[in-house]
């Protein structure tokens, strides 16, 4: 059997660190057998069998010029093997971050904090941080550790499914290369890392007869579980084309009527979501949707979405805000106290 322990990585490759002494091992001989060493492609002897180093080649203070393939041979000239030297560094603790797009699952991503230059893999696991009793710090078997399954195709991500929203978890990401291993432990709670995906299906429509109104509607992100316990709240921003500043409102449901749009100008609208009890952070903004207020006159017919009549108004009418409604069962929000000098729709 070979005297050379096979490091993790491709066969026939041995590893060392720049600036350090490196020992190469001749794989096809018995431990201690004297061998001769050559650099592949160079005929001069690097180290003879009389070196006293047996089956090993010692390179003092290796540098990048030492990388490459070496040939070892026995006393009678038989090939003992070829060895490729690759230089690099031991792993450093990886950079790890975790995020959750819903309240049941979370994912963690990682990246090396230093480039090792060597073949690298990552071991990922997690456990639930649970204390059995006031005086006990022993771990319960139900707290893990469990593997954190990694995405296929080498994406630097693993996903924990079926997490408990109120529990704390300890994530272990260990970077492994042929020169060692280094671990990063990260404590996470779903509440703090929750960041929903942005709302979907954002639509912006004009309100016929109201040149300063736009009606925006959207849906929950598909990744948010369809259960009523954890709702989302929303933030909506809008601005006219070429206008640098956004106006922000917090709608009560899944739609909002903008009443101070600039007549005749297209408007950009975007929405963001957050857990309704303020866990975690706001989502990124949805892709912008565009709409332009209606330029037509007051409609004669009753619109399909509500029985309306209109009246001219000079002073803004102040309405009581409608009572809050659950986000999952929104109703059209037809009245808004921010109406200014325009036709105001009033409930019949």
């Amino acid at each position: 059997s070979s005297p050379c322990p096979q490091a993790w990585g491709p066969p026939g490759v041995q590893y060392g660190q720049p600036g350090r002494s490196v020992k190469l091992c001749c794989p096809g001989v018995t431990a201690g057998d004297p061998v001769s060493w050559f650099r592949d492609g160079e005929p001069k002897l690097l180290q003879g069998p009389d070196s006293g180093l047996g089956h090993e080649l010692v390179l003092a203070q290796a540098d990048s010029t030492d990388e490459g393939t070496y040939i070892c041979q026995t006393l009678d000239g038989a090939l003992g093997g070829t060895v490729t030297l690759q230089l690099g560094y031991p792993p450093a603790r990886p950079v790890v971050s975790c995020q959750a797009a819903d309240y049941e699952n979370f994912s963690c991503t990682w990246s090396p904090s230093q480039i090792s230059g060597l073949p690298t893999r990552y071991l990922t696991s997690y456990r639930k941080k649970t204390v059995l009793g006031a005086d006990s710090q022993r771990r319960s078997p139900s707290t893990g550790p469990w593997p954190c399954p990694q995405d296929p195709l080498g994406a630097a991500r693993c996903v924990v499914h079926g997490a408990e929203f109120w529990s704390q978890y300890r994530i272990n990401v260990t970077e492994v290369n042929p020169l060692g291993a280094s671990t990063r432990l990260l404590d996470v709670s779903l509440q703090s890392i929750l960041r929903p995906d942005p709302p979907q299906g954002l639509r912006v429509e004009s309100v016929p007869g109201y040149p300063r109104r736009l009606r925006a509607s959207w849906t929950y992100p598909a990744s948010w579980p369809c259960q009523p316990h954890f709702l989302l709240k929303f933030r909506l921003q809008y601005r006219p084309a070429q206008h640098p500043a956004w106006s922000t409102v917090e709608p009560a449901g899944l739609e909002e009527v903008i009443t101070d749009a600039v007549a005749g100008l297209p408007h950009a609208v975007r929405v963001s979501a957050r857990d309704f009890l303020d866990a975690g952070t706001w989502s990124t903004w949805s892709p912008e949707a565009w709409g332009t207020p209606s330029t037509g006159t007051i409609p004669k017919e009753i619109p399909a979405w509500g029985q309306l009549h209109t009246q001219p108004e000079v002073e803004p009418q102040v309405d009581s805000p409608a009572p809050p409604r659950p986000s999952l069962q929104p109703h059209p929000r037809l009245l808004d106290h921010r109406d200014s000098v325009e036709q105001v729709a009033v409930l019949a």
Epitope: S36, F38, E42, P43, K44, L45, G48, I71, Q73, D76, G77, A78, L79
Partner: antibody, heavy 117, light 107 residues
Framework: QVQLVQSGAEVKKPGASVKVSCKAS????????MHWLRQRPGQGLEWIGN????????HYNQKFKDRATLTVDKSTSTAYMELSSLRSEDTAVYYC??????????WGQGTLVTVSS | DIVLTQSPATLSLSPGERATLSCRAS??????LHWYQQKPGQAPRLLIK???QSISGIPARFSGSGSGTDFTLTISSLEPEDFAVYFC?????????FGQGTKLEIK
């Protein structure tokens, strides 16, 4: 015991090619390098090249690089050296030699190649 | 290519005498120099490797020395079978090259 038996003498015309064989026995063929050398009448030795024991990797003397081809047939433990575009100055005894990477420990008996019009 | 120059071209000595053969390299080759003996009608035989390392089966009267550019093969007491041609060979860089030979003849 180690034996390298080369093919018989050849007479070739200028411009022709010659292929010399070297059948090895008495050792594990794929453990050792095979070298090819030649010795012109009354002259010194010239190294043509070598071929690796397991991967058939070759090193050639640039002087022969474009004309010499070294091959092995592992199934019959035979090495071959083909020299093309022969000229009169290629008249020589051609040797195969088992060795390590750079030394020649066991030699064949030699094959005389005569190039003459 | 590294050129090896052997001297003398011919050395005439009697059995029992000490023979000293020289090989000089056109550049420093450390100890990557080897010595061969060739008798008429025979293939060469390896005598010394890496300037001074002996070869199994070669009589102890053959020894080598030197490093860098100057090398010596010494036969401490000549036997009749030692009269032959001696070649040095370098393995410091490709192509592997030989000296032109020293013919050791009986005086």
């Amino acid at each position: 015991q180690v034996q390298l038996v080369q093919s018989g003498a050849e007479v070739k015309k200028p411009g022709a090619s010659v292929k010399v064989s070297c059948k090895a026995s008495g050792y594990t063929f794929t453990n050792y390098w095979m070298h090819w050398l030649r010795q012109r009448p009354g002259q010194g030795l010239e190294w043509i090249g070598n071929i690796g024991p397991s991967d058939s990797k070759t090193h050639y003397n640039q002087k022969f690089k474009d004309r010499a081809t070294l091959t092995v047939d592992k199934s019959t433990s035979t090495a071959y050296m083909e020299l093309s575009s022969l000229r009169s100055e290629d008249t020589a005894v051609y040797y195969c030699a088992r060795g390590d990477y750079v030394l020649f420990t066991y030699w064949g008996q030699g094959t005389l190649v005569t190039v003459s019009s | 290519d590294i050129v090896l120059t052997q001297s003398p071209a011919t050395l005439s000595l009697s059995p029992g005498e000490r023979a000293t053969l020289s090989c000089r390299a056109s550049q420093s080759i450390s100890n990557n120099l080897h010595w061969y003996q060739q008798k008429p009608g025979q293939a060469p035989r390896l005598l010394i490797k890496y300037a001074s390392q002996s070869i199994s089966g070669i009589p102890a009267r053959f020894s080598g020395s030197g490093s860098g550019t100057d090398f010596t093969l010494t036969i401490s007491s000549l036997e009749p079978e030692d009269f032959a041609v001696y070649f040095c060979q370098q393995s410091y860089s490709w192509p592997l090259t030989f000296g032109q030979g020293t013919k050791l003849e009986i005086k």
